[in-house]
Structure formats: structure tokens, C-alpha cells
């Protein structure tokens, strides 16, 4: 959950307590286990070649 007093993150991003900033939900494809991805509606799966080149 976003820290008190923090401005809400813009559309397409979510608050990361670990990194102490808003992060792009798009990066959840590459880093799905990041804390901020829980706040993203849906983390799209990585293309096959990105996961298993």
C-alpha cells in the first residue's frame, strides 16, 4: 500500500515501498515479483523468448 502523504502514482504505475517511488506497471512483465506489481491490474506475461531465449 502507498505510504501516507505520498502523491498518488500516475495511471499505469504503482507505488513501490521497496524502491520508495512509483514504478511502471509495464516493468512487471520483466520483474513480476516486485512489490509494486501487486498494485498493477494485470502483469502481462513475458514473451516466450524473453523468458527462455
Amino acid at each position: 500500500e502507498q505510504a501516507p502523504g505520498q502523491a498518488p502514482c500516475s495511471r499505469g504505475s504503482s507505488w513501490s515501498a521497496d524502491l520508495d517511488k512509483c514504478m511502471d506497471c509495464a516493468s512487471c512483465r520483466a520483474r513480476p515479483h516486485s512489490d509494486f506489481c501487486l498494485g498493477c491490474a494485470a502483469a502481462p506475461p513475458a514473451p516466450f523468448r524473453l523468458l527462455w531465449p
Partner: antibody, heavy 119, light 111 residues
Framework: EVKLEESGGGLVQPGGSMKLSCVAS????????MSWVRQSPEKGLEWLAE??????????HYAESVKGKFTISRDDSKSRLYLQMNNLRAENTGIYYC??????????WGQGTTLTVSS | DIVLTQSPASLTVSLGQRATISCRAS??????????MQWYQQRPGQPPKLLIK???NLDSGVPARFSGSGSGTDFTLNIHPVEEEDAATYYC?????????FGGGTKLEIK
């Protein structure tokens, strides 16, 4: 202040080997994917190799042009990135940049180190 | 591999006007939600610097006169109003799959 500093470039003869090094500071090195990117007048910017995190078992990925010739590695305890290059050829000449990204983009760049492969 | 074609190769823009740079990918680099395209600025003698990630998202500290748009195969970097310090070469880069590739660059000159 984020800083990436490459070293190890220079002149090497065709067929020779070279190991590049990069020391990082100012960010959480062990939480960043690290890559090497080469720049040359002939081929422009070329991504060469990437190494991910300990939690990814330090997974590595390579451009086809360097697969089997170059080896990327990292030492999180020293915040260092390496590139071992073997069987070098003239087309490997260029500026080698150490880069770091939280994910699949390049947030941070070093100033680069120049490698010249020539006899 | 995905090929990124930038146009024009060079352009000259008057101070305060708009610069528009295009990048076309040989295949789509977008999902229904996100586009996996970045833009970098490289000034002479310097390394590239990240400007925009995921097609539209400005990196921290990048002036709001820079903006990115596009999806699928066609992407655009706009700079408005152009300032003298924007004289540089601009590159697109996809992260749809490995290998990541860069465009050939667009050199922007200011008059």
C-alpha cells in the same frame, strides 16, 4: 550520485582476449539487471549481453554475434560487472558501455571504454 | 531480430519549434496494455541517456518538453519547444524480446 565506471579497454590483436570491468556506485547494484552495449560507427548501438539477479540464478542472455565468444558476469559483493571477450576480431572494435536497468531498459550508463582490435 | 528504422536520419529545427522523430519496428512491440519501446538522447562525447520508457513514460528528471507516443510498430518522439541543449542524436530501443535492438539514430541540429 549514480556512477558506472568501465575499465580494461585498449588495443588488442585479432584473435586475442580482453576482460572489461565496470564498478558501480550510487544505486542498489544487486537489484539491477546489468548489460554491456557497444557503439561503433559501422553498427551504431548494439546490445551485447545481459545478466540478471541472484534471484534469477544470474541468468545471462547474449546477442547472437557474441554468443560463445563473450561471457558476462557480476560480483554483487563488489558491485562489479565484467565482460570476458575471446577470439576478438576487427568488427569488435568500438566503445563498450556498462549499463544498468531495473528491468528491460537502460537507466544508467557509464562513460564507456574503447576497445580497438587491430594488428 | 526486430529491426528498428528511424526517420529522418537528421533534421534541423529552429529554436522554440517542434522536433518530431519516428521509429518503426519490423513487428509489433506492444501488448493491449503496454508498448516496449524506449528513447535515448546522446550528446556528442557522452553516453546515451534514457528519456522515455515504455513508449510514453518520461524518466525522472527529463523535461516535460519531451514526449513519446505510439503503439504496435509506429512510435514518435516529440520535443517542443526545442532548446539549444537538445542538439543530440536520439535513439529508439525495443525490449519486446531478446535481443534488444536500437534504431540507427536521428541527429537533431538546432538553428
Amino acid at each position: 550520485e549514480v556512477k558506472l565506471e568501465e575499465s580494461g579497454g585498449g588495443l588488442v590483436q585479432p584473435g586475442g582476449s580482453m576482460k572489461l570491468s565496470c564498478v558501480a556506485s550510487g544505486f542498489t547494484f544487486n537489484n539491477y539487471w546489468m548489460s554491456w552495449v557497444r557503439q561503433s560507427p559501422e553498427k551504431g548501438l548494439e546490445w551485447l549481453a545481459e545478466i540478471r539477479l541472484k534471484s534469477d540464478n544470474y541468468a545471462t542472455h547474449y546477442a547472437e554475434s557474441v554468443k560463445g565468444k563473450f561471457t558476462i558476469s557480476r560480483d554483487d559483493s563488489k558491485s562489479r560487472l565484467y565482460l570476458q571477450m575471446n577470439n576478438l576480431r576487427a568488427e569488435n572494435t568500438g566503445i563498450y558501455y556498462c549499463t544498468g536497468g531495473f528491468a528491460d531498459y537502460f537507466d544508467y550508463w557509464g562513460q564507456g571504454t574503447t576497445l580497438t582490435v587491430s594488428s | 531480430d526486430i529491426v528498428l528504422t528511424q526517420s529522418p536520419a537528421s533534421l534541423t529545427v529552429s529554436l522554440g519549434q517542434r522536433a518530431t522523430i519516428s521509429c518503426r519496428a519490423s513487428q509489433s512491440v506492444s501488448t493491449s496494455s503496454y508498448s516496449y519501446m524506449q528513447w535515448y538522447q546522446q550528446r556528442p562525447g557522452q553516453p546515451p541517456k534514457l528519456l522515455i520508457k515504455y513508449a510514453t513514460n518520461l524518466d525522472s528528471g527529463v523535461p516535460a518538453r519531451f514526449s513519446g507516443s505510439g503503439s504496435g510498430t509506429d512510435f514518435t518522439l516529440n520535443i517542443h519547444p526545442v532548446e539549444e541543449e537538445d542538439a543530440a542524436t536520439y535513439y529508439c530501443q525495443h525490449s519486446w524480446e531478446i535481443p534488444y535492438t536500437f534504431g540507427g539514430g536521428t541527429k537533431l541540429e538546432i538553428k
